[in-house]
């Protein structure tokens, strides 16, 4: 009795089993290792990659696909041959029996044979349909890989043209260096002449200094008299101040000016004359709400408000939406200033964003965006960036156009997965995208092949977790 079964074996290949009489035929149709069937929830053309697959890898995969196609064809041919052989044997048997049996019996056998043939043909059609499905799927994957290959070829061409441009630039710079060397020799000669003239001047000045030293001795005597007078004056002033403070404490002149001043950002702190790195109190725009932030008053002219810092893994960055909204951590160490403050600040005027990165090999790089702002909470603090320059990659590692902010309890990314839960930390995830500076902190020698680390893809690749990061903002017109 004919019978047909489809199942999966232990290693995931599809099995097609045909039962005919006492014989059963099992066809193992191979599937490519790294491909999945369309019934799988993982749809290959929806997969987000940080970068296209290597060209060689694609070629290799195409060859594997061709081999599978060949195998399938061979299986079909074998199947057809077998059925033909089987038919021949049965026909011979029928002919031998026909001499001894009556016509009625022959007709019955003929009918049975026709039924069996029809059944087998139907089963064969089913198998062919299955193989055809498999072949169609493989063709689709083949097409996808060829698209990926085209993309790679285009990228290679782009890179080649860029290399050519760089070579042109290089030769131009070499010429410039040579010209500068010539200039340098001429300058050295003139410097030598100036040096001789200066030596003459120095000797003249030495004699003048000797005379001045004599005059200083006389002035010192007078100075001590002045110092005593100044001391007496200071005492009088202090007494007056004490008298004033007891009579009217509210108008006390010793109260520092700083008390009446509020600063919106570190640029304002800097402009008020406080040019030392440190923690300062800032006030929200159009409000009395306050927050403390670290101000970098040295890097690139100073006045930078630090909105994020990672340096040692001491602070957990897998936080809630509210914590990312209001800020967490300590401004002297690892911290997130808070999306609400940054959003309000960057919507008041135009700000630039600088992201400073350090790897574990002692290298540093930065990305500078000439215009940065965050949307309001209603729009999930969506990031807006324009005009990238810097050394941490020519392509923005924060996906463009900007994405909404996502946290473990606020999933606003473009992935069916939850990027924040999967990669840890709150960030402007795409699906999930080429960066996450709020990922897990991994120490040295444990920082590679980490999908959930502190990532800036276009500088260090997808699996590299950075040593330190700082995000800072400053008004564009500073």
């Amino acid at each position: 009795y004919n019978n047909f079964r489809k199942s999966m074996d232990s290693i995931g290949k599809k099995q097609y089993q045909v039962q005919h009489g006492s014989c059963s035929y099992t066809f193992l149709l191979p599937e490519m290792d790294n491909c999945r069937s369309s019934s799988s929830p993982y749809v290959s053309n929806a997969v987000q990659r940080d970068a296209p697959l290597e060209y060689d890898d694609s070629v290799q995969r195409l060859q594997v696909l061709e081999n599978i196609m060949e195998n399938n064809t061979q299986w079909l041919m074998k199947l057809e041959n077998y059925i033909q052989d089987n038919m021949k044997k049965e026909m011979v048997e029928i002919q031998q029996n026909a001499v001894q049996n009556q016509t009625a019996v022959m007709i019955e056998i003929g009918t049975n044979l026709l039924n069996q043939t029809a059944e087998q043909t139907r089963k064969l059609t089913d198998v062919e349909a299955q193989v055809l499905n498999q072949t169609t799927r493989l063709e689709l994957q083949l097409l996808e890989h060829s698209l990926s290959t085209n993309k790679l070829e285009k990228q290679i061409l782009d890179q080649t043209s860029e290399i050519n441009k760089l070579q042109d630039k290089n030769s131009f710079l070499e010429k410039k260096v040579l010209a500068m060397e010539d200039k340098h020799i001429i300058q050295l000669q003139s410097i030598k002449e100036e040096k001789d003239q200066l030596q003459v001047l120095v000797s003249k000045q030495n004699s003048i200094i000797e005379e001045l030293e004599k005059k200083i001795v006389t002035a010192t005597v007078n100075n001590s008299v002045l110092q005593k007078q100044q001391h007496d004056l200071m005492e009088t002033v202090n007494n007056l101040l004490t008298m004033m403070s007891t009579s009217n404490s509210a108008k006390d002149p010793t109260v520092a000016k700083e008390e009446q001043i509020s600063f919106r950002d570190c640029a304002e702190v800097f402009k008020s004359g406080h040019t030392t790195n440190g923690i300062y109190t800032l006030t929200f725009p159009n409000s009395t709400e306050e927050i403390k932030a670290y101000c970098d008053m040295e890097a690139g002219g100073g006045g930078w408000t630090i909105i994020q810092r990672r340096e040692d893994g001491s602070v957990d960055f897998q936080r809630t939406w509210k914590e990312y909204k209001v800020g967490f951590g300590n401004p002297s160490g690892e911290y997130w200033l808070g999306n609400e403050f940054v959003s309000q600040l960057t919507n008041q005027q135009r700000y630039v964003l600088k992201i400073h990165l350090k790897d574990w090999e002692g290298n540093e790089a930065y990305s500078l965006y000439e215009h940065f702002y965050l949307s309001s909470e209603e729009l999930n603090y969506r990031i807006h960036l324009k005009g990238l320059t810097g050394t941490a990659g020519k392509i923005s590692s924060i996906s463009q156009p900007g994405n909404d902010f996502s946290t473990k309890d606020g999933d606003n990314d473009k992935c069916i997965c939850k990027c924040s839960q999967m990669l840890t930390g709150g960030w402007w995830f795409d699906a999930c995208g080429p960066s996450n500076l709020n990922g897990m902190y991994y120490p040295q020698r444990q920082n590679t092949n980490k999908f959930n680390g502190i990532k800036w893809y276009y500088w260090k690749g997808s699996g590299y977790s950075l040593k330190a990061t700082t995000m800072m903002i400053r008004p564009a017109d500073f």
């Epitope: 109190t281 403390k292 401004p331 002297s332």
Partner: antibody
Amino acid sequence: EVQLVESGGGLVKPGGSLKLSCAASGFTFSDYYMYWVRQTPEKRLEWVATISVGGSFTYYPDSVKGRFTISRDNAKNNLYLQMSSLKSEDTAMYYCARDWGLRPWFVYWGQGTLVTVSA
Amino acid sequence: DIVMTQSHKFMSTSVGDRVSITCKASQDVSTAVAWYQQKPGQSPKLLIYWASTRHTGVPDRFTGSGSGTDYTLTISSVQAEDLALYYCQQHYSTPPTFGSGTKLEIK
């Protein structure tokens, strides 16, 4: 373990002066704003003074402005409160406190030092 | 200055009861409210900040809630050791101001 230990309290006459100290340990003192908070005999809590990490910014309520001065010595991990022209309403338990970092909620408090202003 | 008002000076409760202590700010403080517990002879201890975030080591029977100007500290099942003074404080702006305190008494 974070520790804040106040000292310098005592009995003083109205118009007199007193200097309170707070010795900090168990954390990087120069990384945090520091505060003085007092508790009146009626158990009311009142903020008295704030000083920034470097000491360049100081803040006071109007009730003590001009009479009290907050200062710090980051090398010695010490916080100070110089009180002058003391009044009877300054009688209180004075606590030295440290915040969490970004905002002024007080995570750590000292055991307090009692200041009594009485004739 | 922002004024924080705790309308109940005293609250009497029994062990196992649920109790809610309220606090009202004179203006919207955007959930920038902290709660402290002060037991007799001790310094105040931080329980809650940002209106609802429990400080490390604080038992989960203590919960904070509220927004705008109205805030509440709730003890779901009062224990004998919860006998104390409870203060609210706004950490929205300078000066940081405290409520006058609510004394929780055990019947």
